[in-house]
Interface confidence: medium
C-alpha cells in the first residue's frame, strides 16, 4: 500500500483513497454538518458585543486553538502510522492466504478502516468546526475593534482640530482684549484730561456767575430805584388826571359819571361801545383793585380779554409763582395777565378760552374750549376745560383732566422732575404734558427739536417752538 490521500469532491463529500499495488480503494464519507463540540457551544442568535473583546484575550485564545490544532495534527499522524502498520500486517496475512480470499479480506479491512476513519473524521470535523467558529468570532471581534479604533482616531482628529481652532480664536480674542485695554487706558486718560478741562471751565464759570450775581444785585438796586421813580411818576400822572377830570366834571358832569364806570372784562368794555383794540383798565370782581389788559375787539366778534401773548421773545417767562399770580410783561406786547384776576373772573360766570397759534411757515391754528375756569390759589390755580373745537388738534394739548399750575419756585406737576425748571416757564404741567405756551422763545431756524420751546403738541409736535401765541377769554353768553 503506497499512498493514503484525503480530498474534496465536487459535491463537498470527503474522500479517502488507499493505493495498494495496482488496486486503488476509494471511500466516500458523509459530511458531519453542524457538528459542534459540547465544550464550546455556538449560539446563533447571540447579541453581538458593542465593543470588541480585549485584544490580549483574543491573542491568548488563538494560541490555545493553535496548540489544539498541533495536538490534532500529531494525533492524526500517529493514527496514519498505526493504520499503515495494521495494513502491513494484514497485507502479509492476505498475501499468505489464498488470492480468492483477497476480496473478503479487503472488505473487512475496508470496514475496519472505514469505521476508524469515520470516527477520526467526526472528531476532526468537530475540531475544524470549533476552530472555524472561533476564528470567525475572532475575525469579527478584530474587525469591530478596528472600526472602533478608526472611529476613535477620527474623533481625536476632529477634537484636535477643534482645539486648534479654539486656541486660534482664544489668541485672537486675547489680542483683541489687549487692544481694547490699551484703547480703554487711552480713553480713560482722555476722559481725565477732559475732566480737568471741565473743572477749569467750571471754576471759570463760577467766577463769571459770581460777577453776574454782583451785577444782578446792582441791577436789582437800580431797578428798585427806577420802580420808585416810576411809582412817583405814576402818582404825578394820576394826580394830573384827577385834576383834569375835576376840571372837566365842572364843565360836563356826564363825563365824570362815565369815567367812574368800571369794567370786569373786555366783553363789558366792548358792550359799552369801545370797539377798538387796545389796553383797557379792568376791575377785579367785588373789588376796587384794577389791572391793565389788552382787549381784542375785532377777532371773532370782539370782546376778547387777552390773558397771554407771545410774539417776539422780548419778555422772560421764567418767572416766580407771585409774578404769575399778579401778572407781568407789557399788555401791548408779550405779557401774562395774572392767575388771580383770571381765577376770580372765570369763577363769576362761564367763560370760553380761545388759544390762537402761529408757526414759522405762515400757518395759523386755534383751539377753542367751550368752558374754562381756574381754581383758587389754594388749589394752585388748577385749570378746568371742557368742549374742545378748532384746527390745532382734535385732542387737547392742555392735559385732561386739568393740572395744577407750576412755576420754577412752585412745583405742582405730576413728574418726579421739575417740569417748570426743565421746560422753563409757568404752566399747567402734567408729567410734563403736551403743551407749554410759556416756554423759551426760539427764533426762526432755531425752533425745531427744542424740548423747552413754545409747544402745542397736537398741532406741531413736541419739538416745534411756535412763532406766536395768544390766549384769550370771553363770557360764553357773549
Amino acid at each position: 500500500y503506497n499512498n493514503f490521500r484525503k480530498s474534496m469532491d465536487s459535491i463537498g463529500k470527503k474522500q479517502y483513497q488507499v493505493q495498494h499495488g495496482s488496486c486503488s480503494y476509494t471511500f466516500l464519507l458523509p459530511e458531519m454538518d453542524n457538528c459542534r463540540s459540547s465544550s464550546s457551544p455556538y449560539v446563533s442568535n447571540a447579541v453581538q458585543r458593542d465593543a470588541p473583546l480585549e485584544y490580549d484575550d483574543s491573542v491568548q485564545r488563538l494560541q490555545v486553538l493553535e496548540n489544539i490544532m498541533e495536538n490534532n495534527t500529531q494525533w492524526l499522524m500517529k493514527l496514519e502510522n498505526y493504520i499503515q502498520d495494521n495494513m502491513k500486517k494484514e497485507m502479509v496475512e492476505i498475501q499468505q492466504n489464498a488470492v480468492q480470499n483477497q476480496t473478503a479480506v479487503m472488505i473487512e479491512i475496508g470496514t475496519n478502516l472505514l469505521n476508524q476513519t469515520a470516527e477520526q473524521t467526526r472528531k476532526l470535523t468537530d475540531v475544524e468546526a470549533q476552530v472555524l467558529n472561533q476564528t470567525t468570532r475572532l475575525e469579527l471581534q478584530l474587525l469591530e475593534h478596528s472600526l472602533s479604533t478608526n472611529k476613535l482616531e477620527k474623533q481625536i482628529l476632529d477634537q484636535t482640530s477643534e482645539i486648534n481652532k479654539l486656541q486660534d480664536k482664544n489668541s485672537f480674542l486675547e489680542k483683541k482684549v489687549l487692544a481694547m485695554e490699551d484703547k480703554h487706558i487711552i480713553q480713560l486718560q482722555s476722559i481725565k484730561e477732559e475732566k480737568d478741562q471741565l473743572q477749569v471751565l467750571v471754576s471759570k464759570q463760577n467766577s463769571i456767575i459770581e460777577e453776574l450775581e454782583k451785577k444782578i444785585v446792582t441791577a436789582t438796586v437800580n431797578n428798585s430805584v427806577l420802580q420808585k421813580q416810576q411809582h412817583d411818576l405814576m402818582e404825578t400822572v394820576n394826580n394830573l388826571l384827577t385834576m383834569m377830570s375835576t376840571s372837566n366834571s365842572a364843565k360836563d358832569p356826564t363825563v365824570a359819571k362815565e369815567e367812574q364806570i368800571s369794567f370786569r372784562d373786555c366783553a363789558e368794555v366792548f358792550k359799552s361801545g369801545h370797539t377798538t383794540n387796545g389796553i383797557y383798565t379792568l376791575t377785579f370782581p367785588n373789588s376796587t383793585e384794577e389791572i391793565k389788559a389788552y382787549c381784542d375787539m375785532e377777532a371773532g366778534g370782539g370782546g376778547w380779554t387777552i390773558i397771554q401773548r407771545r410774539e417776539d421773545g422780548s419778555v422772560d417767562f421764567q418767572r416766580t409763582w407771585k409774578e404769575y399770580k399778579v401778572g407781568f410783561g407789557n399788555p401791548s406786547g408779550e405779557y401774562w395777565l395774572g392767575n388771580e384776576f383770571v381765577s376770580q373772573l372765570t369763577n363769576q360766570q362761564r367763560y370760553v378760552l380761545k388759544i390762537h397759534l402761529k408757526d414759522w411757515e405762515g400757518n395759523e391754528a386755534y383751539s377753542l374750549y367751550e368752558h374754562f375756569y381756574l381754581s383758587s390759589e389754594e388749589l394752585n390755580y388748577r385749570i378746568h376745560l371742557k368742549g374742545l373745537t378748532g384746527t390745532a388738534g382734535k385732542i387737547s394739548s392742555i392735559s385732561q383732566p386739568g393740572n395744577d399750575f407750576s412755576t420754577k419756585d412752585g412745583d405742582n406737576d405730576k413728574c418726579i422732575c421739575k417740569c417748570s425748571q426743565m421746560l422753563t416757564g409757568g404752566w399747567w404741567f402734567d408729567a410734563c404734558g403736551p403743551s407749554n405756551l410759556n416756554g423759551m422763545y426760539y427764533p426762526q431756524r432755531q425752533n425745531t427739536n427744542k424740548f423747552n420751546g413754545i409747544k402745542w403738541y397736537y398741532w406741531k409736535g413736541s419739538g416745534y417752538s411756535l412763532k406766536a401765541t395768544t390766549m384769550m377769554i370771553r363770557p360764553a353768553d357773549f
Epitope: K394, I395, N449, F451, G463
Partner: nanobody, 120 residues
Framework: QVQLVESGGGLVQPGGSLRLSCAAS????????MHWVRQAPGKGLVWVSR????????SYADSVKGRFTISRDNAKNTLYLQMNSLRAEDTAVYYC?????????????WGQGTLVTVSS
C-alpha cells in the same frame, strides 16, 4: 409697557409695492404723533414720514414724497406706511417710532424694525 411691532417687510422688485404696519400697545395710541424712520445697510437713521395724533396732518421726506403714504387706524392702534414705486435705494430696515410729549421732537419709543429689500 410701551410696545411697537413692525411687520410687512420683505423682498420686492423695483417698481413694486409694500405696506408696512406698526402695531402699538401699552399706551394711548390715539394721543401721540407717530413717525417712520429707516436705516439703509451701513448708513445712519433717516426720517421718512410722520402723522399727527388724529391723522389729519402728515409730512414726508423729499426722497419719498409722492410714492409713500403714511396713515393710522386709531381704533386698531396701528400705524401704516404704503410704499409704491419702490427703488433700490429704498432698501433699509424701517422703524416706527413714537414722538413723546416732552421729547423735543425726538422719539421716546421705537419698534424693532422690519427689513425691506428692493432688488431684481
Amino acid at each position: 409697557q410701551v410696545q411697537l411691532v413692525e411687520s410687512g417687510g420683505g423682498l420686492v422688485q423695483p417698481g413694486g409695492s409694500l405696506r408696512l404696519s406698526c402695531a402699538a400697545s401699552g399706551f394711548t395710541f390715539s394721543s401721540y404723533w407717530m413717525h417712520w424712520v429707516r436705516q439703509a445697510p451701513g448708513k445712519g437713521l433717516v426720517w421718512v414720514s410722520r402723522i399727527n395724533s388724529d391723522g389729519s396732518s402728515t409730512s414726508y421726506a423729499d426722497s419719498v414724497k409722492g410714492r409713500f403714504t403714511i396713515s393710522r387706524d386709531n381704533a386698531k392702534n396701528t400705524l401704516y406706511l404704503q410704499m409704491n414705486s419702490l427703488r433700490a435705494e429704498d432698501t433699509a430696515v424701517y422703524y416706527c417710532a413714537r414722538e413723546g410729549y416732552s421729547s423735543g421732537g425726538q422719539f421716546d419709543y421705537w419698534g424693532q424694525g422690519t427689513l425691506v429689500t428692493v432688488s431684481s
